[in-house]
């Protein structure tokens, strides 16, 4: 059950996609990735207030457990509900080849 | 792939499996199930250091970024990788039923 | 596997439209840096691109003939269309379309060919 | 537009010989070259990206090189099965262009 997607912290302070710019040096991948020189990576950042975006019971659970013990306990993080697929121009043994990564950008997010 | 399982911050310290006993009362269920009386609930909590745990290339992505960027990126989040079911007698309009819950105990964890 | 297929009417007349559809497998164009492109070779001759389009949509054309050309996708079905109006006898040729990951003609499909004669 | 000049419109070699086909850029396109193997009756085919490495499948024979606006592609040992066309392609900027070909062919 994706729970309430009005946040209550302010617009855009919650759970949502961002996108974020880096370069293959940014990411680490410049000896092995050819293409793209700079990414545009979709992830998810922000607050999981109670119930927002709760993503099953266990992040519900999660939420009301987080209020009665906060030092045991987080709140709810902000991840991936699922991913949009990237090609990569890369370097391999046998020579250079596009390869699919399934779950490099994040399509939309929730709280668990 | 599942990077390393060695925690740079001391034992325990890194993202994984916890149990926290809670009643009916903690978790909000006293008024819709009848049992169990008290929950023991497997969580994922700990910190997320480089490569520790990631859960994919999304994640890796996440630990360079939040090393370059940390006030924009947050590091990776420790949670449920899968789940272990549960049962739970509760209140119906129709009487009491038994029923499952596929996605409230974290059966193991991950850093994403 | 990838594979690539185009498929064109085979003969036009001078002025008409040139309708071709690029039918592929092994790869999505819902994929990120995944694109199609169109390129033309004339018998004997060397190669031309034409236009190319992208998973988000993005669509780039030869500006010698971009007047002429509309690139367009079915992504559910696995198809890239393009279409050029008002062929002459300077179009005829072998129409290749190619898997295109950021700008890299991978893989090629057979191609079709077009022959214009009134 | 970018013209990619390929100087050379066949060039004669034998068997177990090493060629070199060059490909010359009107500008700087930095190392955004491509080459593709043409045989006849055949669709091109990738055997170079970003002006030195080797597609993934193609032998070790064929090498490429350069940057800037000079290009070249090496084949060591050439093999029955190397005669064919090579096109150079840039895709430093819009719209991408091809040389004009180089015919490899028997002495």
């Known amino acids: 059950a994706r729970n309430g997607d009005h946040c209550p912290l302010g617009p855009g302070r919650c759970c949502r996609l961002h996108t974020v710019r880096a370069s293959l040096e940014d990411l680490g991948w410049a000896d092995w990735v050819l293409s793209p020189r700079e990414v545009q990576v979709t992830m998810c950042i922000g607050a999981c207030p109670s119930q927002f975006r709760a993503a099953n019971m266990h992040a519900q659970i999660k939420t009301s457990l987080h209020r009665l013990k906060p030092d045991t306990v987080p709140a709810p993080c902000c991840v991936p509900a699922s991913y949009n697929p990237m090609v990569l121009i890369q370097k391999t043994d046998t020579g250079v080849s596009l390869q699919t990564y399934d779950d490099l950008l994040a399509k939309d997010c929730h709280c668990i | 792939a599942r990077n390393g399982d060695h925690c740079p911050l001391g034992p325990g310290r890194c993202c994984r499996l916890h149990t926290v006993r809670a009643s009916l009362e903690d978790l909000g269920w006293a008024d819709w199930v009848l049992s169990p009386r008290e929950v023991q609930v497997t969580m994922c909590i700990g910190a997320c250091p480089s490569q520790f745990r990631a859960a994919n290339m999304h994640a890796q992505i996440k630990t360079s970024l939040h090393r370059l960027k940390p006030d924009t990126v947050p590091a990776p989040c420790c949670v449920p990788a899968s789940y272990n079911p549960m049962v739970l007698i509760q209140k119906t309009d129709t009487g009491v039923s038994l029923q499952t819950y596929d996605d409230l105990l974290a059966k193991d964890c991950h850093c994403i | 596997q990838v594979t690539l297929k185009e498929s064109g009417p085979g003969i036009l007349q001078p002025s008409q439209t040139l309708s071709l559809t690029c039918s592929f497998s092994?790869?999505?164009?819902?994929?990120?840096?995944?694109?199609v492109s169109w390129i033309r070779q004339p018998s004997g001759k060397g190669l031309e691109w034409l236009a190319h389009?992208?998973?988000?949509?993005?669509?780039r054309y030869n500006p010698s003939l971009k007047s002429r050309l509309t690139i367009s996708k079915d992504t559910s079905r696995n198809q890239v269309f393009l279409k050029i109006t008002g062929v002459d006898t300077a179009d005829t040729a072998a129409y290749y379309c190619a898997r295109t990951g950021w700008d890299f003609f991978d893989i090629w499909g057979q191609g079709t060919t077009l022959t214009v004669s009134s | 537009d970018i013209v990619m000049t390929q100087s050379q419109k066949f060039m004669s070699t034998s068997v177990g010989d090493r060629v070199s086909v060059t490909c010359k850029a009107s500008q700087n396109v930095g190392s955004n070259v491509a080459w593709y193997q043409q045989k006849p009756g055949q669709s091109p085919k990738a055997l170079i990206y970003s002006a030195s490495y080797r597609y993934s499948g193609v032998p070790d024979r064929f090498t490429g090189s350069g940057s800037g606006t000079d290009f070249t592609l090496t084949i060591t040992n050439v093999q029955s099965e190397d005669l064919a066309e090579y096109f150079c392609q840039q895709y430093k900027s819009y719209p991408l262009t091809f040389g004009a070909g180089t015919k490899l062919e028997l002495k």
């Open positions: 389009i992208y998973w988000d949509d993005d669509k």
């Open positions: 092994g790869f999505s164009l819902n994929t990120s840096g995944m694109g």
